[in-house]
Structures are given as structure tokens and as C-alpha cells.
């Protein structure tokens, strides 16, 4: 009769984390008598995964009844697979011997690779706001995935970005991997409503990528433009001067009126008008009693926005 | 030697659509000589799935080498499973005979059930807007799932709804199923920012339910409240009357001022103030030259909102 062969039909098996892995093994003969064992790895440091006759292997079940007469199927199933279970598994036939059983023949091995999903990408932006035309950095991180192959893309409002750098760690073999990417985004005045998206594609996601987002509203400061104008008034002894504060973000704004350099009134903006692009407008007016002035008056609208240095605009009111 | 038995160790196997199904079968003896075949179903109408010796079965692979001497493992793997593959599969041993091989013994059968994910739920709302305190209906649909057991829940802003009716079709056995649910939602004035969510849980989703959403902003109309007031004016010959249009949604609004029933001015609201609840406010003012009037004037602020019938508020301006 032909000498026994140990057949491991699959060279490799890929399993999703949390699932069970079936490792198949068949013998071509019932002879010689002796137990079957499964190991991970080869050589002196190999790890025993299953011993047919003794030991405790709660995660392992046999696919068929090993003690059944004429059974030649020694396939096993390992439950609740994690990335740490990856490796090459060998089905090994032993021949009974004294004092110890003797290894008789090993299968060619089945490489178990574990597919583990990446964690939800976390996108974080800059610690301080920047103004339009400046560049800010966003980072995206995801962990715990396997295999190592992964694709990361950045988008701003659906448009793919190209200025980014991505690392997958560790560089060598590992049970699972992490990805870290930094994208550089140039801010524009219209970016209050903009979003950056980090999109991760991985074999475990079955074509349904994971996305992490960040709002540019957290990263941008749009400084206001000021315009001071005089409104027509039908009453002769009064002048109505308005300060139009336009297209600023975020909300926080304090306005001070000065008459010839002296503080006349200070206001904190509350009810703002929101523009379509997410910036705000606000208008303040000053009624000036022209009877109280002999000479021309310089009216100054001074605005402090989001804790930044104040900006101002002046208007010379002619007293005729 | 004992008479040959055909062992199908699994009574049932459940596989996700797109994956491969392994159907296990082992013989307890090499005798009698004859081929093995796999069928779906029993009786005269059974479907041949695999014939060891002849025919073309591109989706079927054998788990071990069937021609190997002493092989007793006749397990097969069927690739790219779809819901249409569900059924009971029998491993059948034939004995060589003349003119035809004769069925010798059948395994007990393995029921293959196919797990197919439901499609992303699509939520649709009413065709026309309704006002607060009225009830509107939302529908949610999802298709193509298997098995039939599925759970659908409705939420409004995270609060579970109870007034809904759900059907799963068809009622009898099918390769896949569809779900249709209609929820009745009572609108409130604060619902512009509200969302209804249809949440579907199914065994294939591994505890990560699918969600479909609809915004109540598409379904609601919040009619405005009007308030007409006179503002103090320092100029004696002028009166400033304002019409405060509050808490309306959606944006579309046209305002007409009438003086003693005659149209004075018509405006279309553009720059609106958005409230926290998503409704809008707008203010219009009318400067009235009191010198031009001898008698008291009735000023009417008339508002047409979102194509609905106009509402109005009047103010009697006393000419002293």
C-alpha cells in the first residue's frame, strides 16, 4: 500500500476577525497507528494548536468524528479568530513510539490570514484657526486592520485632495496595522461650510469605505470687511451713520464707535444675518446730533473679531 | 465490514451571499465501487449539483482529491452563493450497474440557507408640506434580504416612534424578501431641524443596523406670526412702522404694505435671520410722511408665505 500522505488542500485561508477558521487536513491511509496534532509554525518553537488525544483546546472543534472507524479527515475549526491567530498551520501525523510518539509526516501547511476591519477614521484639525489663503493640516488615523494593504483618500467638499502624506505602521509583519495621514488644505473665504473627508478602503469593507469628517468651520477665521456710510435723514438736525460689518466668521464680534477718537458706544453683536456661505453680516448705526457739533466730526467704527487685533474704518461727517 | 454509510455531518449550513458554501460529506467505506453525486432537493425533480465523473460544474470544487486512493471525503464547495442557491443538498453514493449506475445510499441532507444583506433603506416623505399639529406619513423600503426575520424601528430625533405599520413580502418561502413600513409623524413647530430615521436590523449586519433618514424640513410648513409696531422717531414729521414676520419656514415670503388698503410697497424677503429651531424671522419697515396725511392711517402688513393664502396684520397710525 502507498505510504501515508498528509494532505492540506488549501495553501491559504483568509478569515474575518470574529469568525471561525476551518483548516482542512486528510490522511490517505489508516497506517501507521498514531495521533494527529496541529501546530502553528514549524521547528522547535512551533505552537501546539490541537492534540487529538489530550490537552485543553476550547476554541478548537473537529470537523468530523476523529474516532470514527476509517476516518481520514482531521480538519479542525478554530473559533473567534483574531489577528493574533495569523500564521501557517501544519497538520502532523505521529507514529506511536517509546518513550515518546515520533513525528511521522507533516502536511504542507495552510497559511491563515486574518482580515480585521480598520477602526472608524478619526479626523482632527489644527489647534488654532487660520485665515483664508493660509494652509492648515488635518490628520486622519485608523487602527487594528489586517491585511496591511489599505487605501486612504482625502476630499474637500467631494473634490479629491493631492497634498497629503500617509504612513502605515509597522513597516514589517504584524498581526494588525495602523494608518496615519496628514493633509494640507488651503483655506478660502467660502470654506465655512466646507468639510474635509478622510476615506479608507480595505478588503474587509466590501467596497463600502469608512469615512471620517471634519468641518473647516472649526479651523477657519474669516476677518470682516467694514464699510461706514451716511444714511439720508429727513430730520435736519440728525445724521445716521451706519457701519456694515460683512462676511466674518466665527460669530464673536465687538464693535466700538468713536467720535473724534472718543468712545461713544460699545456693542457686542448678537442677532447676526447669516450669508449663504456661512459667514455673518452685522450692521450698527449711530445717530449723531449735528446741533451738538460746530466742526466736522470723524466717526470711527472699530471692530474686534474673535479675539484678534481690532480693525477700524473712519468717516468724516461734514457739519454744514 | 460494516455497510457503507453516507455521513453529512451538518444538518444545516448558513452562508453569506457572495461567499462559498462548504457542504461536507464522508463515506465510511470504499465499498461498493461507484460514483458520488450531489443533488439539491429529493425525488424526481431533484437538481444535479455535482457529478464526480462527468459534466461541467464550474462553481463546484471538491475539498479533497476525490481520485486519491482511499479517499473517503466527498465534501464540495460551491462558490459565489446567491439566495437562489438555498435548499437541501444531498450527497448520494451510486453503485456501478448495467445499464445504469444504481443509487445505493443518500446522506441525510444539509440545508443551505443564504444570508443576504438588506439594501440601504430608502425613506420618503409626503408630497406636500403640512403645518404643525398635523400628521404626515413617511415610508421606508429595503429589499433583497434573507433570511426573512428582520426588525424595523422608526425614530424621530432619537426617540422611538410607535405609530407605524410594517409588511415583509412575500409571506411564504422565497429566496429573498422586501420590507415596507409606513410611519405616521405628528409635526410640531420645532421640527424644521428634526429627522426621521428608519433603522433596520438583520442577522447579516452583525449588530450594525442600516439607517435611512429623511428631514422633516422637506415636509413641514411653519406659518409666520406677524407683529406691526411703531418705532420712536426723533423727526416729528415721520413715522417708522415695522412689521416683524417671525418663525416661518420655508424661506419663500412676499410682503406687501398697504396704506388705507392701497398698495404702498411690495418686497420679497431675501436676507433672513435664522432662529435656532431652523425657522426664519424678517423685519420690514415703512417710513410714513405724516405731513402727507390729514386723517389717521391704517397700515396693513400683508404676507404671502410659501404660496399659501396671504395673512395680514393692521396698525392704526394716529395723525395728531
Amino acid at each position: 500500500e502507498d505510504e501515508l500522505q498528509v494532505i492540506q488542500p488549501e495553501k491559504s485561508v483568509s478569515v474575518a476577525a470574529g469568525e471561525s477558521a476551518t483548516l482542512r487536513c486528510a490522511m490517505t491511509s489508516l497506517i501507521p497507528v498514531g495521533p494527529i496534532m496541529w501546530f502553528r509554525g514549524a521547528g522547535a518553537g512551533r505552537e501546539l494548536i490541537y492534540n487529538q488525544k489530550e490537552g485543553h483546546f476550547p476554541r478548537v472543534t473537529t470537523v468530523s468524528e476523529l474516532t470514527k472507524r476509517n476516518n481520514l479527515d482531521f480538519s479542525i475549526s478554530i473559533s473567534n479568530i483574531t489577528p493574533a491567530d495569523a500564521g501557517t498551520y501544519y497538520c502532523v501525523k505521529f507514529r506511536k513510539g517509546s518513550p515518546d510518539d515520533v513525528e511521522f509526516k507533516s502536511g504542507a501547511g495552510t497559511e491563515l490570514s486574518v482580515r480585521a476591519k480598520p477602526s472608524a477614521p478619526v479626523v482632527s484639525g489644527p489647534a488654532v484657526r487660520a485665515t483664508p489663503e493660509h494652509t492648515v493640516s488635518f490628520t486622519c488615523e485608523s487602527h487594528g486592520f489586517s491585511p496591511r494593504d489599505i487605501t486612504l483618500k482625502w476630499f474637500k467638499n467631494g473634490n479629491e485632495l493631492s497634498d497629503f502624506q500617509t504612513n502605515v505602521d509597522p513597516a514589517g509583519d504584524s498581526v494588525s496595522y495602523s494608518i496615519h495621514s496628514t493633509a494640507r488644505v488651503v483655506l478660502t473665504r467660502g470654506d465655512v461650510h466646507s468639510q474635509v473627508i478622510c476615506e479608507i478602503a480595505h478588503i474587509t469593507l466590501q467596497g463600502d469605505p469608512l469615512r471620517g469628517t471634519a468641518n473647516l468651520s472649526e479651523a477657519i477665521r474669516v476677518p470682516p470687511t467694514l464699510e461706514v456710510t451716511q444714511q439720508p435723514m429727513r430730520a435736519e438736525n440728525q445724521a445716521n451713520v451706519t457701519c456694515q460689518v460683512s462676511n466674518f466668521y466665527p460669530r464673536g464680534l465687538q464693535l466700538t464707535w468713536l467720535e473724534n477718537g472718543n468712545v461713544s458706544r460699545t456693542e457686542t453683536a448678537s442677532t447676526l444675518i447669516e450669508n449663504k456661505d456661512g459667514t455673518y453680516n452685522w450692521m450698527s448705526w449711530l445717530l449723531v446730533n449735528t446741533c451738538a457739533h460746530r466742526d466736522d466730526v470723524v466717526l470711527t467704527c472699530q471692530v474686534e473679531h474673535d479675539g484678534q487685533q481690532a480693525v477700524s474704518k473712519s468717516y468724516a461727517l461734514e457739519i454744514s | 465490514e460494516d455497510e457503507l454509510q453516507v455521513i453529512q455531518p451538518e444538518k444545516s449550513v448558513s452562508v453569506a451571499a457572495g461567499e462559498s458554501a462548504t457542504l461536507r460529506c464522508a463515506m465510511t467505506s470504499l465499498i461498493p465501487v461507484g460514483p458520488i453525486m450531489w443533488f439539491r432537493g429529493a425525488g424526481a425533480g431533484r437538481e444535479l449539483i455535482y457529478n464526480q465523473k462527468e459534466g461541467h460544474f464550474p462553481r463546484v470544487t471538491t475539498v479533497s482529491e476525490l481520485t486519491k486512493r482511499n479517499n473517503l471525503d466527498f465534501s464540495i464547495s460551491i462558490s459565489n452563493i446567491t439566495p437562489a442557491d438555498a435548499g437541501t443538498y444531498y450527497c448520494v453514493k451510486f453503485r456501478k450497474g448495467s445499464p445504469d449506475d444504481v443509487e445505493f445510499k443518500s446522506g441525510a441532507g444539509t440545508e443551505l440557507s443564504v444570508r443576504a444583506k438588506p439594501s440601504a433603506p430608502v425613506v420618503s416623505g409626503p408630497a406636500v408640506r403640512a403645518t404643525p399639529e398635523h400628521t404626515v406619513s413617511f415610508t421606508c423600503e429595503s429589499h433583497g434580504f434573507s433570511p426573512r426575520d428582520i426588525t424595523l424601528k422608526w425614530f424621530k430625533n432619537g426617540n422611538e416612534l410607535s405609530d407605524f405599520q410594517t409588511n415583509v413580502d412575500p409571506a411564504g418561502d422565497s429566496v429573498s424578501y422586501s420590507i415596507h413600513s409606513t410611519a405616521r409623524v405628528v409635526l410640531t413647530r420645532g421640527d424644521v431641524h428634526s429627522q426621521v430615521i428608519c433603522e433596520i436590523a438583520h442577522i447579516t449586519l452583525q449588530g450594525d443596523p442600516l439607517r435611512g433618514t429623511a428631514n422633516l424640513s422637506e415636509a413641514i410648513r411653519v406659518p409666520p406670526t406677524l407683529e406691526v409696531t411703531q418705532q420712536p422717531m426723533r423727526a416729528e414729521n415721520q413715522a417708522n412702522v415695522t412689521c416683524q414676520v417671525s418663525n416661518f419656514y420655508p424661506r419663500g415670503l412676499q410682503l406687501t404694505w398697504l396704506e388705507n388698503g392701497n398698495v404702498s410697497r411690495t418686497e420679497t424677503a431675501s436676507t433672513l435671520i435664522e432662529n435656532k429651531d431652523g425657522t426664519y424671522n424678517w423685519m420690514s419697515w415703512l417710513l410714513v410722511n405724516t405731513c402727507a396725511h390729514r386723517d389717521d392711517v391704517v397700515l396693513t402688513c400683508q404676507v404671502e408665505h410659501d404660496g399659501q393664502q396671504a395673512v395680514s396684520k393692521s396698525y392704526a397710525l394716529e395723525i395728531s
Epitope: 505552537e47 501546539l48 494548536i49 492534540n51 489530550e54 490537552g55 485543553h56 474516532t67 506511536k96 515518546d100 | -
Partner: antibody, heavy 113, light 108 residues
């Protein structure tokens, strides 16, 4: 449920032979090696030997070789351990165990003249 | 024959303290074949840790096992009253199988 039930306590004279049984339920004895372990009063555990009930193959510790015989009856799902030429230092609790994971309750053997 | 030597023979500690039990082998043992058992007076030993570091079913997470080659350790991070017992290490890497002499963990 896996259970290993051993026979009751024995008192023997020096030179005699004792045979302890271990009846198992919840599994087929042929599927696993059956081990026997000795524990003298106040002392540690000592491995005696094991049997493969499928083919009756045995392994023994050198200390017990020649005096111990382990057998199994697959029809009754029972393993046996026989120790001959008893001496006072054989006074101990004897345990059977299934594949190193599940243990019987122990059988006390007292050797005394 | 592989001789397993456990240290200390007796360990006196109070509940809440950390316990470290050692098991040293006279020649290398594959980590797959190193087991730990707990035994309380009048009871049969119970499998506690298998394959060096895996907790048997129902064993609390305060227990852990580690080691390789000739040196193995059982650690209890914070002792509970029910942990006081005798612990044995056991190798089944080669015949004859052997046990350590045991470490008695007693209440201080």
C-alpha cells in the same frame, strides 16, 4: 456534561494489589487519553501513566513501571488503574483525568498492616 | 525526565496584594505544553491556565500566565480570599509527564 466518577476508598495490606475504576460520561473514552495521578497525604501531584483506550497503548512513569497496569473497557466507558506490591508509601489519593483537562473526584487508598 | 521546580514553596500575602508564582524547568518546555492547576483541600485539582497563558473557562481575569523555554510564571494582580490554595505547574511536553511540587498561597 463531562463526568469522571471513581470507585470508593480502599484499605489494603502491604504486598496486596488494588484496582481502581474511573467511569466516564459525556464523552467517548476512545476519543481521549486517560491519565492517572497520585497524591500522597500533604504532598504534591505525581503522574503515574496513561492509556489510549482506542488501541490500549500505555505509557508509565519510570517510578511506577512494573507495578502499575492501566486498562480501559470501551464498551462500558471505564478506565482502570491496578497497583501491585503495595507498600505504606503508596498510601495516597489517586485521580483519573481525561486528557489533562477534566479530573475524577479521587480515590483514597490506605496501605496498612 | 523534565523536573519542574516551583518557588516559593509558600507565599504569604494579604487580599488585594499581587502574587507571583514561578515554575522553572530543568530543560526547555514548549509553551503549548505548560499547564497550571489549582487545588483546594479535599478537592481534585482544577485546570486553571493552559498553554502557558490561556485562562480556563470561568477563571477570573486577575489571573495571568506567561513564560517560555524553562521559566514560567503565574500572576494574580489583586488577591481575593478565594484565591488562597495550592497551585501546581505541569508539563506534558515529553514523557514522563511531571508536576512541580506546588506553591501554597496562604493568607498573611
Amino acid at each position: 456534561e463531562v463526568q469522571l466518577v471513581q470507585s470508593g476508598a480502599e484499605v489494603k495490606k502491604p504486598g496486596a494489589t488494588v484496582k481502581i475504576s474511573c467511569k466516564v460520561s459525556g464523552f467517548n473514552i476512545k476519543d481521549y487519553y486517560m491519565h492517572w495521578v497520585q497524591q500522597a497525604p500533604g504532598k504534591g501531584l505525581e503522574w503515574i501513566g496513561r492509556i489510549d483506550p482506542e488501541d490500549a497503548e500505555t505509557k508509565y512513569a519510570p517510578k511506577f513501571q512494573g507495578r502499575v497496569t492501566i486498562t480501559a473497557d470501551t464498551s462500558t466507558n471505564t478506565a482502570y488503574m491496578e497497583l501491585s506490591s503495595l507498600r505504606s508509601e503508596d498510601t495516597a489519593v489517586y485521580y483519573c483525568d481525561r486528557g489533562l483537562a477534566y479530573w475524577g473526584q479521587g480515590t483514597l487508598v490506605t496501605v496498612s498492616s | 525526565e523534565i523536573v519542574l521546580t516551583q518557588s516559593p514553596a509558600t507565599l504569604s500575602l494579604s487580599p488585594g496584594e499581587r502574587a507571583t508564582l514561578s515554575c522553572s524547568a530543568s530543560s526547555s518546555v514548549s509553551s503549548s505544553y505548560l499547564y497550571w492547576y489549582q487545588q483546594k483541600p479535599g478537592q481534585a485539582p482544577k485546570l486553571w491556565i493552559y498553554s502557558t497563558s490561556n485562562l480556563a473557562s470561568g477563571i477570573p481575569a486577575r489571573f495571568s500566565g506567561s513564560g517560555s523555554g524553562t521559566d514560567y510564571t503565574l500572576t494574580i494582580s489583586s488577591l481575593e480570599p478565594e484565591d488562597f490554595a495550592v497551585y501546581y505547574c505541569h508539563q506534558w511536553s515529553s514523557y514522563p509527564y511531571t508536576f512541580g511540587q506546588g506553591t501554597k498561597l496562604e493568607i498573611k
